[in-house]
């Protein structure tokens, strides 16, 4: 924003001098921290979002902005109050140099303090196609319904609402919050101003090129003509759709964040708010041929985080980078030359590519989704849109080695009826962060809130792990891997599925003494297994022979090394029925799996026995995969020996409830 | 730099209002700070009278909250004073203020 | 109200001399911060009053660091080490703590 006063340039002017600030926050015993973007040429020093406590009134935040002001006063420091946040988050946005950043972490009430930094455009027929099941032609695409009951929110460059693909299906709001553009002569041109956010608006609800024809919707301008925004003001953004919805509740609410920069803890706290509060965010993974969780909003855990793929299921490749991958994308979708509204004239078109694209695919499904069940959750509609997608088709060998197996290999499909999923028992897999190679170090993968954890698993590239465990934290179950001594570090697998009205435990059965290893049942009546995990202390579990097998007539059982404790988890839920089902391979192999009939849905994956050489255990899809380290490097056969176990269930009370309502 | 300059009539008569001005340059109003009325006695006591935030909250001296008011014209960048039923004890100099910077003050004499 | 007692009400100095100015507050300038706002400030004759010092022992930017504050809790003092010509006025303290915002009665100082 341009300063209408001169009264800045004191302070640009210490800016300029001054180094580069805090990197970290004061040894001042203050619990407040501040925080900066990673990526250098995209900080913007000078501007701070000040974050504070979750339950401060407006009123507090004002004075405490006012307190902040009149101690930099006093320091002979100008500072300007930008916002005042309420809504989502409270806090301000504050106009002051980094040496007062020491200062601003001791106020009171203060949680964080972010420097603010610069967000990007995510762009550079065969796309409905590709969503388009099979029963339908894509030239005659005629979605089952259009999404005219959602409303969706597109936050993103100014936009041409008159092209004849658009007009009348969005509403311009009058939101503005754009820095200034870079370079003296840079030619504000309106075609070039509207391009982006014309061209999305196409793909999620044009007359000819859109994927939900019948969605309405409504524009914030939070990128400048050259396609950049800040965090700040998509922040405000998000604060001004949070306003709206309180003012005038509508139906369900989907909001289109095309746009990413770096990893960003007060953007991703401000898309958490918003998901909380009933609102659908679909984000754009990113363009930097890189780890989608270290931009932002893409690694925010609420938001629907879509990669990018082109006709042939490829990962895009954009110039010298392409797509981002890894564990915090979601889904793909169609992302290369995908053609949509022109703003060069109100009747052209042109093909533009980019996760940006593909974004706007999954908002324009998931309008379409809540259209015709607008009652469903986010929890809900994620777990949909997973279900539904066209499954290992992307050509994983395009990812980083690391990063194949953290990258959900599925592209986004309409349902083939947007009715009648309700009797599914819908389970995705989640993956935690790397715990990292210290010795202690563990990894925390969580489910959303109104998931259930059905089981944990861990996988070590370096098969130098301790196992997994579930348990509880804040009221709600986790799952923990944890870290070796040598280990390059572990992740942690959670298994996370609808499942209403479940009441769920975990049974834990220390160390058995005796030679035939350790074993652990659901006791209670009337709950199933649901997953199995076993967590050591010992360095390096030893092989156990013979190997350690379930009896049978036995399912609600829990089987594993006599050295580690083994973790049942045992759930009671309406109409949930359970059975094991395993995969035995005698011959050492890399590989071992064990995949779920149809109908059932994998709640557990589990490996037996669990001795060192097995890497891990995860699912994929209604697989369980078992890894082992390479065949060349295993000793005897019987020491490769593997077994994939697999829990697989189904839930009647949904499948008979499903009936009742067709 | 920012500055403050105070404005209105150096003379009012008793039990009428007495109303001020504080035109601020170098800074807009609506992007921080408390911007406040002070007042200095002829001996030498200061009062603290109030202020309005940049957010257009106010803030009163308990002693003179029935008869203060602060209000501000964003489009002018000023910020105004007006005292009501006004007696020969409210004869001060007058200034506004954005602690910890003042205006030059103004004299006003309460007297019929 | 915060009422704070400054003494002395008169003092006389000779140039070059020391001398110091008492502030006791009724009650503890400790914010919940852990500052104690409170400031030291002097009007010059014809002149608004300038900042001093702040949060009790700062001194404002360009004043001499013959201007010492010190004090804690509900007792300050504003020591001048050695005075010169351009030293005379009346020293306010002044609390920022609590609301309303107070001043102390003054000090005026003058050169023998």
């Known amino acids: 924003q341009e300063d209408e006063d001169g009264d800045y340039e004191e302070l640009v002017l210490a800016l300029r001098s001054e180094e580069d600030g805090l990197a970290e926050a004061p040894e001042h015993g203050t619990t407040a921290t501040f925080h900066r973007c990673a990526k250098d040429p995209w900080r913007l020093p000078g501007t701070y979002v000040v974050v504070l406590k979750e339950e401060t009134h407006l009123s507090q935040s004002e004075r405490t902005a006012r307190r902040l002001q009149a101690q930099a006063a006093r320091r002979g420091y100008l500072t300007k109050i930008l916002h005042v946040f309420h809504g989502l988050l409270p806090g301000f946005l504050v106009k002051m140099s980094g040496d007062l950043l020491e200062l601003a972490l001791k106020l009171p009430h203060v949680d964080y303090i972010e420097e603010d930094s610069s967000v990007f455009a995510q762009s550079i027929p065969w796309n409905l196609e590709r969503i388009t099941p099979p029963r339908y032609r894509a030239d005659e695409y005629q979605p089952p319904d259009g999404g005219s009951l959602v409303e969706v929110y597109l936050l993103d460059t100014s936009i041409q609402s008159d092209h004849r693909e658009i007009e009348g299906r969005v509403m311009v709001t009058d939101f503005e919050n754009v820095p200034e553009e870079d370079g003296t002569r840079f030619h504000r041109q309106a075609s070039k101003c509207d391009s982006h956010g014309t061209h999305l608006a196409g793909v999620v609800s044009g007359r000819d090129a859109g994927v939900a024809k019948g969605a309405s919707m409504r524009s914030l301008r939070v990128l400048n003509c050259q396609g950049k925004g800040t965090v700040s003001g998509t922040l405000i953004g998000l604060e001004f759709i949070r306003k709206s919805q309180l003012v005038q509740p509508v139906g369900p609410l989907v909001v289109l964040l095309p746009l990413a920069g770096g990893y960003s803890r007060v953007l991703n706290a401000a898309c958490q708010r918003l998901a909380r509060a009933g609102v659908v965010l679909v984000t754009a993974a990113g363009n930097f041929r890189d780890d989608a969780c270290l931009y932002s909003p893409a690694s925010a855990p609420e938001v629907i985080t879509v990669g990018a793929t082109n006709a042939q299921d490829q990962p895009v490749t954009l110039g010298t980078l392409g797509t981002n991958f890894g564990r915090c994308v979601d889904l793909f979708a169609p992302g290369e030359d995908i053609i949509g509204a022109s703003s060069d004239c109100s009747t052209c078109f042109v093909s533009q590519s980019g996760t940006s694209q593909a974004a706007a695919h999954v908002a324009g499904i998931a309008a379409m989704m809540l259209s015709a069940e607008p009652e469903l959750t986010l929890a809900e509609l994620r777990q949909r849109l997973i279900h539904f997608s066209a499954k290992d088709v992307i050509n994983e060998a395009w990812f980083p080695e690391d990063q194949r197996v953290l990258t959900p290999n599925l592209v986004a499909a309409l349902p083939p009826s947007t009715h009648g999923a309700g009797w599914q028992l819908f389970c995705r897999t989640v993956w935690s962060a790397h715990s990292g190679p210290t010795r202690m170090a563990t990894a925390v993968a969580r489910c959303a809130p109104d998931e259930e954890l059905l089981s944990c698993s861990s996988f070590s590239r370096s098969g130098k792990r301790r196992g997994e465990r579930m348990e509880a934290q804040g009221g709600k179950l986790v799952c923990r891997a944890h870290n070796a001594f040598g280990g390059e570090g572990v992740y942690a697998i959670a298994r996370c599925c609808l499942l209403p009205q479940a009441n769920c435990s975990v049974h834990t059965a220390p160390p058995a003494e005796a030679s035939m290893g350790t074993r652990v049942h659901c006791h209670q009546q009337g709950h199933v297994l649901t997953g199995c995990s076993s967590h050591w202390e010992v360095e390096d579990l030893g092989t156990h022979k013979p190997p350690v097998l379930r009896p049978r007539g036995q399912p609600n059982q829990c089987v594993g090394h006599r050295e580690a404790s083994i973790h049942a988890s045992c759930c009671h839920a309406p109409g949930l029925e359970c059975k094991v089902k395993e995969h035995g391979i005698p011959a050492p192999q890399e590989q071992v799996t064990v995949a779920c009939e149809e109908g059932w849905t994998l709640t557990g994956c589990s490996a037996l026995p669990g001795t060192s050489h097995v890497l891990g255990a995860y699912a994929v899809d209604n697989t369980c995969v078992v890894r082992s380290r390479d065949v060349s490097t295993t000793g005897s056969t019987s020491e490769g020996a593997v077994t994939a176990v697999a829990i697989c269930c189904r839930s009647r009370h949904l499948a008979q409830a499903s009936q009742e309502l067709q | 730099e920012v500055q403050l300059q105070e404005s209105g009539p150096g003379l009012v008569k008793p039990s009428q209002s007495l109303s001020l001005t504080c035109s601020v340059t170098?800074?807009?109003?609506?992007?921080?700070?408390?911007w406040s009325w002070i007042r200095r006695f002829p001996g030498n006591t200061m009062e603290w009278m109030g202020d309005?935030?940049?957010?257009?909250?106010?803030n009163y001296n308990p002693s003179l909250k029935s008869r203060v008011s602060i209000t501000r014209d964003t489009s002018k960048n000023q910020f105004f004073l007006q005292l009501n039923s006004v007696t020969t004890g409210d004869t001060a100099t007058y200034y506004c203020?954005?602690?910890?910077?003042w205006g030059q003050g103004t004299l006003v004499t309460v007297s019929s | 109200d915060v009422v704070l007692t400054q003494t002395p009400v008169f003092l006389s100095v000779t140039l070059g001399d020391q001398t110091s100015i008492s502030c006791r507050s009724s009650?503890?300038?400790?914010?919940?911060?852990?500052?104690?706002?409170l400031e030291w400030y002097l009007q010059k004759p014809g002149q608004s009053p300038q900042l001093l010092i702040y949060?009790?022992?700062n001194r404002f930017s360009g004043v001499p660091d013959r201007f010492i504050g010190s004090g804690s809790g509900t007792d300050f003092t504003l020591k001048i080490s050695r005075v010169e010509p351009e030293d005379l006025g009346v020293y306010y303290c002044?609390?920022?703590?609590?609301?309303?915002?107070?001043f102390g009665s003054g000090t005026k100082l003058e050169i023998k």
């Open positions: 309005i935030s940049y957010s257009g909250s106010t």
């Open positions: 203020a954005k602690l910890p910077g």
């Open positions: 949060e009790v022992s």
């Open positions: 170098g800074y807009t109003i609506t992007s921080g700070y408390d």
């Open positions: 009650q503890s300038l400790e914010y919940s911060d852990g500052y104690t706002y």
């Open positions: 002044f609390q920022g703590t609590h609301d309303p915002l107070t």
